[in-house]
């Protein structure tokens, strides 16, 4: 069950996909991939009131366990639900090649 | 890529699986959930440093990013990486039913 | 209109060959670097095979080094992908896509084909 999309917190403030852009030096991947220099890595953050973007059973049950035990059990966290492939040419013993990673990118994100 | 099982931060200060007892009223089930009264909720609670547990490429990239950006990407968080069934006897309109949830108690933990 | 047509796909026996061609209409294919992806039934897209606008520079996934060949007409404002020596995992949708650098990425490339559909069994 993916609950509401509604944020009681504001616009933008609760879980959803944000772009941060990175370099090769930012990532540590300048020893190891040739292109693209630059990665526009989407990912998921903000905050996870109640019900918002619920994942499942488990993300339901974590907000109230929350609810009643703030020190003991977190909020539920902004994951992503799924991922975009990303290809980078990377180096390799005998040159160049083209590889594809599936869990790279976020493509959209929920609370969990 | 599941990487380091070594906590640096002390013993079960990292993500891993906890415990949590509940009662229908805590979950909010005493209206529809007949059996049982009490449930040990596993859930995946406790910090996330610098590769440990990470899930995939994408959990990499969020730790390279948060130690440059820690006001903007937050830490890798601790979430479910599989989950164990529970099965619950609920109320219905003509009874009682037996049902099975497969997204209710952590399994085992990662980071993402 | 702008768009991309994948063409040339077939059913073909392990060992043999197949061309693939990528069509451009309504823009210039040269300004831009073109890329090949392959998606197989239930798995992810996987990038096969890029050539750049710049120098024509090639790359490859390693499933396909030694075996596919990519090249470009300009003239025909075309982009090909020759198949030599396929193998039954080679079966898949094969697409292009344009976009201004390599590696062409997946999710954000400027535009992409509706795919041809490539079959290697006996």
């Known amino acids: 069950a993916r609950n509401g999309d509604h944020c009681p917190l504001g616009p933008g403030r609760c879980c959803r996909l944000h772009t941060v852009r990175a370099s090769l030096e930012d990532l540590g991947w300048a020893d190891w991939v040739l292109s693209p220099r630059e990665v526009q890595v989407t990912m998921c953050i903000g905050a996870c009131p109640s019900q918002f973007r619920a994942a499942n059973m488990h993300a339901q049950i974590k907000t109230s366990l929350h609810r009643l035990k703030p020190d003991t059990v977190p909020a539920p966290c902004c994951v992503p639900a799924s991922y975009n492939p990303m290809v980078l040419i990377q180096k390799t013993d005998t040159g160049v090649s083209l590889q594809t990673y599936d869990d790279l990118l976020a493509k959209d994100c929920h609370c969990i | 890529a599941r990487n380091g099982d070594h906590c640096p931060l002390g013993p079960g200060r990292c993500c891993r699986l906890h415990t949590v007892r509940a009662s229908l009223e805590d979950l909010g089930w005493a209206d529809w959930v007949l059996s049982p009264r009490e449930v040990q909720v596993t859930m995946c609670i406790g910090a996330c440093p610098s590769q440990f547990r990470a899930a995939n490429m994408h959990a990499q990239i969020k730790t390279s990013l948060h130690r440059l950006k820690p006001d903007t990407v937050p830490a890798p968080c601790c979430v479910p990486a599989s989950y164990n069934p529970m099965v619950l006897i609920q109320k219905t309109d003509t009874g009682v039913s037996l049902q099975t949830y497969d997204d209710l108690l952590a399994k085992d933990c990662h980071c993402i | 209109q702008v768009q991309l047509v994948e063409s040339g796909g077939g059913l073909v026996q392990p060992g043999g060959s197949l061309r693939l061609a990528c069509a451009a209409s309504?823009?210039?294919?040269?300004?831009?670097?073109v890329g090949w992806f392959r998606q197989a039934p239930g798995k992810n897209p996987e990038g096969v095979s890029c050539?750049?606008?710049?120098?024509?520079?090639?790359y490859y996934a390693d499933s396909v080094k030694g075996r596919f060949t990519i090249s470009r007409d300009n003239a025909k404002n075309t982009v090909y992908l020759q198949m030599n020596s396929l193998k039954p995992g080679d079966t898949a949708v094969y697409y292009c896509?344009?976009?201004?650098?390599?590696?062409?990425?997946?999710?954000?490339?400027?535009?992409r084909g509706q795919g041809t559909q490539v079959t290697v069994s006996s």
């Open positions: 896509a344009a976009d201004l650098s390599c590696p062409v990425q997946i999710a954000t490339f400027h535009s």
């Open positions: 050539i750049s606008s710049s120098d024509g520079s090639a």
């Open positions: 309504g823009f210039t294919l040269d300004a831009y670097a």
